[in-house]
């Protein structure tokens, strides 16, 4: 019969022959022959392979280096890599999360639109009219100006995006 030019899924072509790939968590030791199956070997501790493969070496698990602000989010297995994330107050600098940077704070006049996570930075927004923020914070949203009317007071000093209004007593007309 004609030697194959293509192989089924989870197989690979070698020496005009279709050999089985090694399953995730195992690496290739020797290709199949006419008389023998593909020989595979489990990855050792701290190693993984996450696909059907013909790799001769397993990959080493990623190390989540605390010196770079990293911590383990999920421990690796023989079939999965370790997933790193950042310590509280930090976020990853890239999708691969190889290092972390401190969450940005929103300056006075700006509030937090979205709190940072282990993988995304703080998103700030300018405080619109009627709202203010007088602190630099990675958590505080813009606060609404105090409503003097509900306290039976009047505005003595207008608010800004960085300061609240100042309320005071209403001037009473004397008889």
């Amino acid at each position: 019969p004609e030697p194959p030019t293509a192989c089924r899924e989870k197989q690979y072509l070698i020496n005009s022959q279709c050999c089985s790939l090694c399953q995730p968590g195992q690496k290739l030791v020797s290709d199949c022959t006419e008389f023998t199956e593909t020989e595979c070997l489990p990855c050792g501790e701290s190693e993984f392979l996450d696909t059907w493969n013909r790799e001769t070496h397993c990959h080493q698990h990623k190390y989540c280096d605390p010196n770079l602000g990293l911590r383990v989010q999920q421990k690796g297995t023989s079939e999965t890599d370790t997933i790193c994330t950042c310590e509280e107050g930090w976020h990853c600098t890239s999708e691969a999360c190889e290092s972390c940077v401190l969450h940005r704070s929103c300056s006075p006049g700006f509030g937090v639109k979205q709190i940072a996570t282990g993988v995304s930075d703080t998103i700030c927004e300018p405080c619109p009219v009627g709202f203010f923020s007088n602190v630099s914070s990675a958590f505080e949203k813009c606060h609404p100006w105090t409503s003097c009317e509900t306290k039976d007071l009047v505005v003595q000093q207008a608010g800004t995006n960085k300061t609240d209004v100042v309320c005071g007593p209403q001037d009473r007309l004397r008889a």
Epitope: V29, L41, C43, E45, Y63, R71
Partner: antibody, heavy 118, light 106 residues
């Protein structure tokens, strides 16, 4: 800085039980396996077993099954190994160590000497 | 269980001499770790994943091998290399150590 600090030396009578500890700093104990290794006086290294502190899963060398019991407390980042029914041949230095890729050092504790003597 | 046999058990080498320590397994393993131990101290990881030098290990050391046959090589022996070296496999439970090779300086 990563450190594994073990409890102090112990002298025990035959038949007694000893529990030694290994407290880690510089990483969360639940993130990596902790291995225990025995070294009898003038002898080589023997692997006793390992624990996954996250879920308590353990693997032992059959030789130490029933002799050693490994546990871990993630709240204090401490691993423990208890040795029961002590005999003179249990006299050794016992080490705790991490999965090898922790910072490519594979950190080891300083060792705990257990002496069994009547 | 996998038995690791180290050879030689004991050897001495002159400064500048090339040293090869072997570690053979009773069946194939994924990788070998090498540890160095000096008297009265804890072992230190020396080579991981068969051929990668651990942090702080001098470049005169190298590791190689695959399957059931591995080796640690020192290109030029130095006095500070005198120690006992152990290989370990972490592929199949129970994990096992070789019996050790005591390397002395002449």
């Amino acid at each position: 800085e990563v450190q594994l600090v073990q409890s102090g030396a112990e002298v025990k009578k035959p038949g007694a039980t000893v529990k030694i500890s290994c407290t880690v700093s510089g990483f969360n104990i639940k993130d990596y396996y902790i291995h225990w290794v025995k070294q009898a006086p003038g002898k080589g290294l023997e692997w006793i077993g390992r624990i996954d502190p996250e879920d308590g899963d353990t693997k032992y060398d059959p030789k130490f099954q029933g002799k050693a019991t490994m546990t871990a407390d993630t709240s204090t980042d401490t691993a423990y190994m208890e040795l029961s029914s002590l005999r003179s041949e249990d006299t050794a230095v016992y080490y705790c160590t991490t999965s090898y890729y922790v910072g490519t050092y594979g950190y080891w504790g300083q060792g705990t000497t257990v002496t069994v003597s009547s | 269980q996998i038995v690791l046999t180290q050879s030689p058990t004991i050897m001495s080498a002159s400064p500048g001499e090339k040293v090869i320590i072997t570690c053979s397994a009773t069946s194939s393993v994924s990788y070998i770790l090498w540890f160095q131990q000096k008297p009265g101290t804890s072992p230190k990881l020396w080579i991981y994943s068969t051929s990668n030098l651990a942090s702080g290990v001098p470049a005169r050391f190298s590791g190689s091998g695959s399957g059931a046959s591995y080796s640690l090589t020192i290109s030029r022996m130095e006095a500070e290399d005198a120690a006992t070296y152990y290989c370990q496999q972490r592929t199949f439970y129970p994990y096992t150590f070789g019996g050790g090779t005591k390397l002395e300086i002449k």
